[in-house]
């Protein structure tokens, strides 16, 4: 994993400007881990970043991710009067100019370098789950969440009508 200590320094300059025409309502620098306390880490390999899910050694420093929160109307057409309410969208940036992207064709989660305005594939609906966990649902593909598969992040289709264990789409955010 590479160090991301520089994140704090560029945070303000990077995110003061608007993204998709609006500014984030708030930002949060946090480490990302799975429900089972494995760390999400980012490594530079062959000039591109890879994302890993791994157990860190006791004193190994966790990588940080900058979460930028945005307000959004729910895209559902179930209620024309807007009663479905506003929700929170989030973008995740582990290092300058790179954001997590949903690759729906490959069912993968990738780090892409991109300029603003960010594409829809970089936005995820934040779900507030129990046990102080969150889930991230693809803006571009409702019902598809960031999850853990074979020690990597992947896109996982979740059907609310199915009875299955969802621990693999639960994540913890921590400032430490």
């Amino acid at each position: 994993a590479f160090g991301i200590s520089g994140v704090q320094k560029y945070t303000r300059a990077l995110h003061d400007s608007s993204i998709t025409g609006i500014s984030p309502i708030t930002e949060y620098l946090a480490s990302l881990s799975t429900y089972n306390d494995q760390s999400i880490t980012f490594a530079l390999e062959d000039e591109s970043y890879e994302i890993y899910v791994e157990d860190l050694k006791k004193d190994e420093k966790k990588d940080k991710v900058l979460l930028s929160y945005y307000e959004s109307q729910h895209p559902s057409n179930e209620s024309g009067d807007g009663v479905d309410g506003k929700m929170l969208m989030v973008t995740l940036s582990p290092t300058k100019d790179f954001w997590l992207h949903a690759n729906n064709k490959e069912h993968s989660v990738e780090l892409h370098k991109c300029e603003k305005p960010l594409p829809d594939q970089a936005f995820f609906v934040l779900h507030n789950m129990h046990s102080n966990c969150v889930s991230f649902e693809c803006k571009t593909d409702p019902g598809v969440f960031i999850g853990v598969k074979d020690n990597h992040l992947a896109l996982i289709k979740v059907d609310s009508s199915e009875n299955l264990c969802t621990e693999n789409i639960l994540f913890k955010l921590s400032e430490t």
Epitope: D84, N128, S161, E162
Partner: antibody
Framework: EVQLVESGGGLVQPGGSLRLSCAAS????????MNWVRQAPGKGLEWMAE??????????HYAESVKGRFTISRDDSKNTVYLQMNSLRAEDTAVYYC????????????WGQGTLVTVSS | DIVMTQSPDSLAVSLGERATINCRAS??????????LNWYQQKPGQPPKLLIF???SQGSGVPDRFSGSGSGTDFTLTISSLQAEDVAVYYC?????????FGQGTKVEIK
Amino acid sequence: EVQLVESGGGLVQPGGSLRLSCAASGFTFSNYWMNWVRQAPGKGLEWMAEITLKFNNYSTHYAESVKGRFTISRDDSKNTVYLQMNSLRAEDTAVYYCARRNYGNYYINVWGQGTLVTVSS
Amino acid sequence: DIVMTQSPDSLAVSLGERATINCRASESVDKFGMSFLNWYQQKPGQPPKLLIFVASSQGSGVPDRFSGSGSGTDFTLTISSLQAEDVAVYYCQQSKDIPYTFGQGTKVEIK
């Protein structure tokens, strides 16, 4: 139109039981966490119970004051959430609101009109 | 449990004037870098209606005169210019931890 309609309220003696129902319409019921919130006459709001989704194993949570006496459940095929209330006490007298949390689960944004439960001998 | 305390219990404000309601939590309601604090309005004989979520974001269709602020344990709901239709009881609620707890309510009337 998004709607929640409660039923099953009424007069019951202390120690008795009652089952409240809440029929949902106008949205995909199985996608939303459901809650019950009550309001005693002339008093404030008190959250009672919550049930999550099938893929969350329908996990449930309760206020301490009703734990062990009240049970929340749902039937997604009928678009209905229930509140089974046992060992009722005079202090359970209240209007009981069925409520839906928003998509993402940060707040309640759809409420029923409420059903009155009166516990008295 | 997180205890939510509102002040004042009641408030009389002239039409067009500013109304301010405070809410204090017994412990921080912050998580994930946000404050999980909501404000609801309840008119007589009606269910509550969401005004503000995560401390400062307006609910859908809520007039701009309603705004929220604060973080951690101290929060404020402001009605910038009170209208006759704003007469109601206002509740804060934390949705950080179960049990989700409400403040005791603040009754807003016209002076």
